[in-house]
């Protein structure tokens, strides 16, 4: 056998080159046939009407033909025949790769609530061979479950990702990335997660700055509440007691002027949104005013008093007890 061919892999729409090569040429005729065994070329003559076949080289040692705009129907065995005695035949297999036509990502709901599990689907349509789908949340790879559907030698792959969302996932992209021999570079599509979460509450003492609360002083506390959607209600309450008469509430701020010992207690900032309710506590302890010592007549004594301030903030972010978790469906 001195007739040789090589298998060809080509991407749909591109050019395949078929070569029939003779090692020891004796001027025998070379013929190229298609998978239906119709003659494409007999020497330099093309009996087929298909003008996508073009003669690249014709000699006693080679018949080289190009096939432009390859389609999946061109796939199969192409036969080289050498008219020796006895005749020789060799075949080359053309494999056509088809990149996915379309890449679609579908998210179960536009907005999810923290702790909820959502379904994300990605479909790569009509490829050959079947596409491999990879999932990423930001830079972290996740594992999906793929199903392959075959129709007329083409494959549609759907990958399902079940994703439990956390508040940190808000604004993070979920990426569906395909790997396919006909695709060079990165073919991907993404959707950004929108995660609703209950408020996180933090109390800031804005006055006095040194943090020591004495009788007669003023106290200013600011409640910072962050959630999604942004908390609609921020309220101050005094735990197990009435709010002092001289306390002033202004949005997220609580002012208590002219502090006295009866103001001692726990002050709670509560914030809520459609996901849930959370609070943070501030324990107020009012210290005695600084004592003034009258100046001595003869001796000067300097006394240094060190006061230790204990500032305790208790944060409780239980959702569902005081507030209801509600999923938003669109």
């Amino acid at each position: 056998q001195n007739l040789f061919t090589k298998d060809v892999t080509v991407i749909e729409g591109e050019v395949a080159t078929i070569s029939c090569q003779v090692n020891k040429s004796d001027d025998s005729v070379i013929q190229l046939l298609n998978p239906n065994r119709q003659t494409i070329y007999f020497r330099d003559f093309r009996p087929l009407k298909d003008s996508r076949f073009q003669l690249l080289n014709f000699s006693s040692s080679e018949l080289k033909v190009s096939l432009t705009n390859v389609s999946i129907s061109d796939e199969g065995r192409y036969f080289c025949q050498l008219y020796t005695d006895p005749p020789q035949e060799s075949y080359t297999t053309i494999t056509v790769l088809v990149p996915p036509r379309n890449l679609m990502i579908d998210i179960q709901k536009d907005t999810a609530v923290e702790g909820e599990e959502i379904e994300v689907n990605c479909t790569a349509m009509a490829s050959k061979p079947a596409t491999t789908i990879r999932w990423f949340k930001g830079n972290t790879e996740l594992k999906g479950k793929s199903e392959v559907e075959e129709w007329s030698d083409m494959y549609t792959v759907t990958s399902q990702l079940m994703l439990k969302v956390h508040k940190e996932d808000d604004g993070v992209p979920v990426i569906c990335q395909v790997e396919h021999p006909a695709v060079t570079g990165n073919l991907q599509t993404q959707r950004y997660l929108e995660v609703q979460y209950k408020p996180q509450v933090h109390i800031q003492m804005t006055y006095p700055l040194q943090g020591l609360t004495r009788e007669g002083d003023a106290l200013e506390l600011t409640c910072e509440a962050i959630g999604k959607p942004q908390p609609v209600m921020v309220t101050w309450v005094r735990v197990d007691d009435e709010m002092p008469q001289h306390a002033v509430l202004s949005g997220p701020n609580l002012f208590i002027n002219n502090l006295n010992k009866t103001d001692n207690g726990t002050y709670r900032c509560e914030a809520s949104n459609i996901v849930g309710k959370a609070h943070s506590d501030y324990m107020l302890y009012v210290y005695d005013p600084p004592t003034t010592i009258p100046p001595p007549t003869t001796t000067t004594t300097t006394t240094t008093t060190t006061t230790t301030t204990i500032l305790t903030i208790i944060t409780d972010s239980r959702a569902g007890e005081e507030g209801s978790i509600r999923a938003v469906d669109h």
Epitope: V29, R43, D44, F45, P47, K49, Q54, L55
Partner: nanobody, 118 residues
Framework: QVQLVESGGGLVQPGGSLRLSCAAS????????MYWVRQAPGKGLEWVSA????????YYADSVKGRFTISRDNAKNTLYLQMNSLKSEDTAVYYC???????????WGKGTQVTVSS
């Protein structure tokens, strides 16, 4: 101007014979390989036979081997196809063509109809 004119077609019964001719002009006939190609109703083109420049080497498709004979007369610039033991599947339009390495069917004849039927 290149011209290829086929003749000799017609209606024949299965088992019968016909001889097709192709008169060539407008090119140096003796310098080119010559071919017979056919197209059956509703089918693609099928290569039937080939002959080298001098006529010493002939080639046939498996479907006609042993029944058809290709020949040429370089002095008369004519190509022939002797068809024996005709079958109904030989029904087609027969074209003659020359292998000039040029793509397409620009240098083919108009064809002659062969119908094999009882």
């Amino acid at each position: 101007q290149v011209q290829l004119v086929e003749s000799g077609g017609g209606l024949v019964q299965p088992g019968g014979s016909l001889r097709l001719s192709c008169a060539a002009s407008g090119f140096t006939f003796s310098s080119y390989w010559m071919y017979w190609v056919r197209q059956a109703p509703g089918k693609g083109l099928e290569w039937v036979s080939a002959i080298n420049t001098g006529g010493g080497s002939t080639y046939y498709a498996d479907s006609v081997k042993g029944r058809f004979t290709i020949s040429r007369d370089n002095a008369k610039n004519t190509l022939y196809l002797q068809m024996n033991s005709l079958k109904s599947e030989d029904t087609a339009v027969y074209y003659c063509a020359y292998g000039n390495g040029v793509e397409g069917m620009d240098y083919w004849g108009k064809g002659t109809q062969v119908t094999v039927s009882s």
